[in-house]
């Protein structure tokens, strides 16, 4: 969550309504909407902890 | 329930290596960021590692970067800290913790952590 | 790095009183997404912390409304309005909005 973050990626979208659901009935495929990197070319959005939240549904 | 549970630490000599691991179940493993807070004797709390959801992306502070990697297996919805060149800094107990979610707090569930000594 | 500063480092009280803790971080706290990220966490004694407060004045599941958070910018408070034997422990803020996250230095809270 440092502006030293931001690089040209995807746009990345933050999913909504999370709970702590149980896990046998909780079925989805993510896809991963950047490639894997650390620290110095994580993503950097206005979203709320876009940094940390990278899935999308 | 939601439940994290350490496992891993020991005693090591400086210069040595160790593997941290946490089991954790009652949630969507895949769904949330994960890190690691190491608490030292003097009791002061110190973020060592976050691993964003789906694990793409990893954070440390400089005093452990490049000794230190975070990681996780969601098939086996386990978080896991691989330490080496450890330090007699590093002697702590070692916490493993949940993420609220994207608009929650950062630390919403510890573990009942591992101790780690560095020690000759 | 941000340092965040606690005072005061121990914090007699009575029962039903009220307790106000501070914690300054050293610069701006203020992410760039327009959020603060500044948390506080209860640790009582031979247990793991446990959070309280998210987002300045957000209290987390379960936590009584006898907590409060406020603050802004470098500025943050935690008050307890009637404080309870359950509340008594050391008390730590934290900031997640610059890498290296950093917490403060604990406050401890204990019967005067």
């Known amino acids: 969550p440092i502006s030293a973050f931001a690089v040209d990626i995807p746009e990345i979208h933050e999913r909504e309504g999370y709970e702590d659901e149980i896990d046998d009935e909780y079925e989805v495929d993510w896809s991963n909407s950047s490639s894997a990197t650390s620290g110095s070319g994580a993503p950097s959005t206005d979203k709320e902890k876009s940094w940390l939240y990278t899935l999308d549904p | 329930e939601v439940q994290l549970v350490e496992s891993g630490g020991d005693l090591v000599k400086p210069g040595g290596s160790l593997k941290l691991s946490c089991a954790a179940s009652?949630?969507?493993?895949?769904?949330?960021?994960m890190s690691w807070v190491r608490q030292t004797p003097e009791k002061r709390l110190e973020w060592v590692a976050s691993?964003?959801?789906?694990?793409?992306?990893?954070y440390y502070p400089d005093n452990v970067k490049g000794r230190f990697t975070i990681s996780r297996d969601s098939a086996k919805k386990s978080l896991y800290l691989q330490m080496s060149h450890l330090k007699s800094e590093d002697t702590a107990m070692y916490y493993c913790?949940?993420?609220?979610?994207?608009?929650?707090?950062?630390?919403?569930?510890w573990g009942t952590g591992t101790t780690v000594t560095v020690s000759s | 790095d941000v340092l965040m500063t606690q005072t005061p480092l121990s914090l007699p009280v009575s029962l039903g009183d009220q307790a106000s803790i501070s914690c300054r971080s050293s610069?701006?706290?203020?992410?760039?997404?327009?959020?603060?990220?500044l948390e506080w966490y209860l640790q009582k004694p031979g247990q793991s912390p446990k959070l309280l407060i998210y987002?300045?004045?957000n209290r987390f599941s379960g936590v009584p409304d006898r907590f409060s958070g406020s603050g802004s910018g470098t500025d943050f408070t935690l008050k307890i309005s009637r404080v309870e034997a359950e509340d008594l422990g050391v008390y730590y803020c934290?900031?997640?909005?610059?890498?290296?996250?950093?917490f403060g230095g604990g406050t401890k809270l204990e019967i005067k």
């Open positions: 913790t949940k993420d609220g979610g994207p608009r929650e707090g950062y630390f919403d569930v």
């Open positions: 009652g949630f969507t493993f895949s769904n949330y960021a």
């Open positions: 691993i964003s959801d789906g694990g793409s992306y990893t």
């Open positions: 610069q701006s706290i203020v992410h760039s997404n327009g959020n603060t990220y």
């Open positions: 987002k300045v004045s």
């Open positions: 934290f900031q997640g909005s610059h890498v290296p996250y950093t």
